[in-house]
């Protein structure tokens, strides 16, 4: 572990209450193929424990969705991954809208610091699928 | 190689016969920019030779496709990546539907074990593009 | 650095003049969360400085876009990432069309050599967003 190979792959636990757009994640072998090796979960949000450049990736699929589900809303359903605490480092890292699709998937390299908590905000009125092969979120430390 | 840097990037060889939804892959420098360094191919399916956590990624583009091609079906064309053998470890790792799009692309971290064979199942009646910059599938060992 | 951990994450600087489909990139901590550690920029294009297999990833979001923006064109807006110089190694590595979506995101493993310059060509009449969480391009050296 001293090599700094911090890594996590999470599955969706639940969505937040109505005014809370955050997705709440869970991880661990007992749950399936999710795991946390270094990073930790704090009330369903992912907290980084080692400084470095990370590859952050996410896939979110909307539940019981068709093209018409996503196209018939004024404001497209949007997913944003960002640092939500500490407040001084708050920033959006990755943002995608569903438009006429039902799945978004992306990845990016970004510097993260020990103590950064990542939030994944899903805005809109459609629910994310909890199927573990459709919705997942992970980080991988790649270099100091 | 003893570091465990197993890695592969494959290009589409062909689709299966009508009742076989699997995509058949090929790799090697003679074919272009595809390669296998550690993992191996078994009848067009990717077999893992080293235990560890892998980053699995895929992009599939449908051939001569427009939004109407994908939207006019009851059942959206779907791509699933999973462990198909050994049967005791069979599971879907990653699943995406095309809906009104013509390309899906995603990636995820997942634990894989020596002997796991990964299958990529494309359900529907549209053909995947064989262009090497449009359809590809790869894995990268990232840690034990 | 001798470990060969070359890595870069870039943000969009600007598009080219009308007959130039290339996107021009920029990177550096002063600009936000982008950085270059090994690779370098040559007139906005990313140049590789170390041989190896790289994970190349990109996300491009179209500015002020809705599904109708992308669907009402004869020729779908397309993004291609390729080696554009040296000419002897010119090849398209990754290609995606927007169809009825407003964002494309993908990644792939590919061998790159010192001196390879990567170009990202956006064809069509829609502009890419310059928001750093919507449009970004990066490479990560993963093994020799």
């Amino acid at each position: 572990e001293s090599l700094g190979w911090d890594i996590a792959e999470l599955q969706l636990n639940h969505t937040g209450p109505q005014q809370d757009p955050r997705l709440y994640w869970q991880g661990g072998p007992a749950l399936g193929r999710s795991f946390l090796r270094g990073p930790e979960l704090d009330k369903g949000q992912l907290r980084i424990r080692r400084d470095g450049i990370y590859m952050v990736h996410i896939q979110v699929t909307l539940a019981i969705c068709s093209s018409t589900s996503t196209s018939r809303h004024h404001h497209p359903t949007t997913l944003a991954v960002g640092i939500c605490s500490p407040a001084s480092r708050s920033i959006s890292l990755l943002r995608l809208s569903f438009h006429q699709g039902c799945t978004i998937a992306s990845q990016r390299l970004t510097p993260l610091a020990r103590g950064d908590t990542l939030c994944t905000n899903l805005t809109g009125t459609l629910l994310p699928s909890r199927n573990t092969d459709e919705t997942f979120f992970g980080v991988q430390w790649v270099r100091p | 190689e003893s570091l465990g840097w197993d890695i592969a990037e494959l290009q589409l060889n062909h689709t299966g016969p009508q009742q076989d939804p699997r995509l058949y892959w090929q790799g090697g420098p003679a074919l272009g920019r595809s390669f296998l360094r550690g993992p191996e191919l078994d009848k067009g399916q990717l077999r893992i030779r080293r235990d560890g956590i892998y980053m699995v990624h895929i992009q599939v583009t449908l051939a001569i496709c427009s939004s109407t091609s994908t939207s006019r079906h009851h059942h959206p064309t779907t791509l699933a990546v999973g462990i198909c053998s050994p049967a005791s470890r069979s599971i879907s790792l990653l699943r995406l539907s095309f809906h009104q799009g013509c390309t899906i692309a995603s990636q995820r971290l997942t634990p894989l074990a020596r002997g796991d064979t990964l299958c990529t199942n494309l359900t529907g009646t549209l053909l995947p593009s064989r262009n090497t910059d449009e359809t590809f599938f790869g894995v990268q060992w990232v840690r034990p | 650095e001798s470990l060969g951990w070359d890595i870069a994450e870039l943000q969009l600087n600007h598009t080219g003049p009308q007959q130039d489909p290339r996107l021009y990139w920029q990177g550096g901590p002063a600009l936000g969360r982008s950085f270059l550690r090994g690779p370098e920029l040559d007139k906005g294009q990313l140049r590789i400085r170390r041989d190896g297999i790289y994970m190349v990833h990109i996300q491009v979001t179209l500015a002020i876009c809705s599904s109708t923006s992308t669907s009402r064109h004869h020729h779908p807006t397309t993004l291609a990432v390729g080696i554009c110089s040296p000419a002897s190694r010119s090849i398209s590595l990754l290609r995606l069309s927007f169809h009825q979506g407003c964002t494309i995101a993908s990644q792939r493993l590919t061998p790159l050599a010192r001196g390879d310059t990567l170009c990202t060509n956006l064809t069509g009449t829609l502009l890419p967003s310059r928001n750093t969480d919507e449009t970004f391009f990066g490479v990560q050296w993963v093994r020799p």
Epitope: - | L12, Q18, T61, A63, I64, T68, S69, S71, R72, H73, H74, G124, T125, L126, L127, S129, R130, N131, E134 | -
Partner: antibody
């Protein structure tokens, strides 16, 4: 076994309209596009257009826009083509055809054809 | 529209010999790693019958004496050895884009 049964021959007067049918059996009607093809006596084949019965998505050859209208009735698994303002140029055998397994425009199953004769 | 030109317009081949029919497209019908060219057989008073799809794939139930080849703009249908029942008109057809178009046909007579 897949079958496409077309309606019988038609003798019509110039300026009239007619609607021919193509009844599908042996498969799920709404799963497959139905194409229509024209063949003038002793001549080659011309694609008119297609209809997808699932959502009534249609595409026409520019040459036949305004001449042909494609519709379907899911309840009876029947596709229809209506031809209007008929002239002697419309005298031909008209075939309905079903695509093959893959959803692209090549034609694995054909109806027997409907002969249309336009004559005063 | 893509124009398909077949040659010859007609040919006569002896029983057991090889029949070769050519189809030339006005632009490439290759895309996405496939060749979108197909061949049909039509006998008098009958509907066309699919023989070959995607340039070289034999349709189920079609005898192996039929074969297709070619890519880009130049295509060939071969029948070998020719049998009596192969007397018919043969058409090429592309599906590279809409509208799909057909060649003018080649009439095969068995000597």
């Amino acid at each position: 076994e897949v079958q496409l049964q077309q309606s019988g021959p038609e003798l019509v007067k110039p300026g009239a309209s007619l609607k021919m049918s193509c009844k599908a059996s042996g498969y799920t009607f709404t799963d497959y596009v139905i194409h229509w093809v024209k063949q003038k006596p002793g001549q080659g084949l011309e694609w008119i257009g297609y209809l997808h019965p699932y959502n009534d998505d249609t595409k026409y050859n520019e040459k036949f826009k305004g001449k042909a209208t494609l519709t379907s009735d899911k309840s009876s698994s029947t596709a229809y083509m209506e031809l209007n303002s008929l002239t002697s140029e419309d005298s031909a055998v008209y075939y309905c055809a079903r695509r093959g397994y893959y959803d692209y425009a090549w034609f694995a199953d054909w109806g027997q054809g409907t002969l249309v004769t336009v004559s005063a | 529209d893509i124009v398909l030109t077949q040659s010859p317009a007609s040919l006569a081949v002896s029983l057991g010999q090889r029949a070769t029919i050519s189809c030339k497209a006005s632009k490439s019908v290759s895309a996405s790693g496939y060749t979108w060219m197909h061949w049909y057989q039509q006998k008098p008073g009958q509907a066309p019958k699919l023989l070959i799809y995607l340039a070289s794939n034999l349709e189920s139930g079609v005898p192996a004496r039929f074969s297709g080849s070619g890519s880009g703009t130049d295509f060939t249908l071969n029948i070998h050895p020719v049998e009596e029942e192969d007397a018919a008109t043969y058409y090429c057809q592309h599906s590279r884009e809409l509208p799909p178009t057909f060649g003018g046909g080649t009439k095969l007579e068995i000597k």
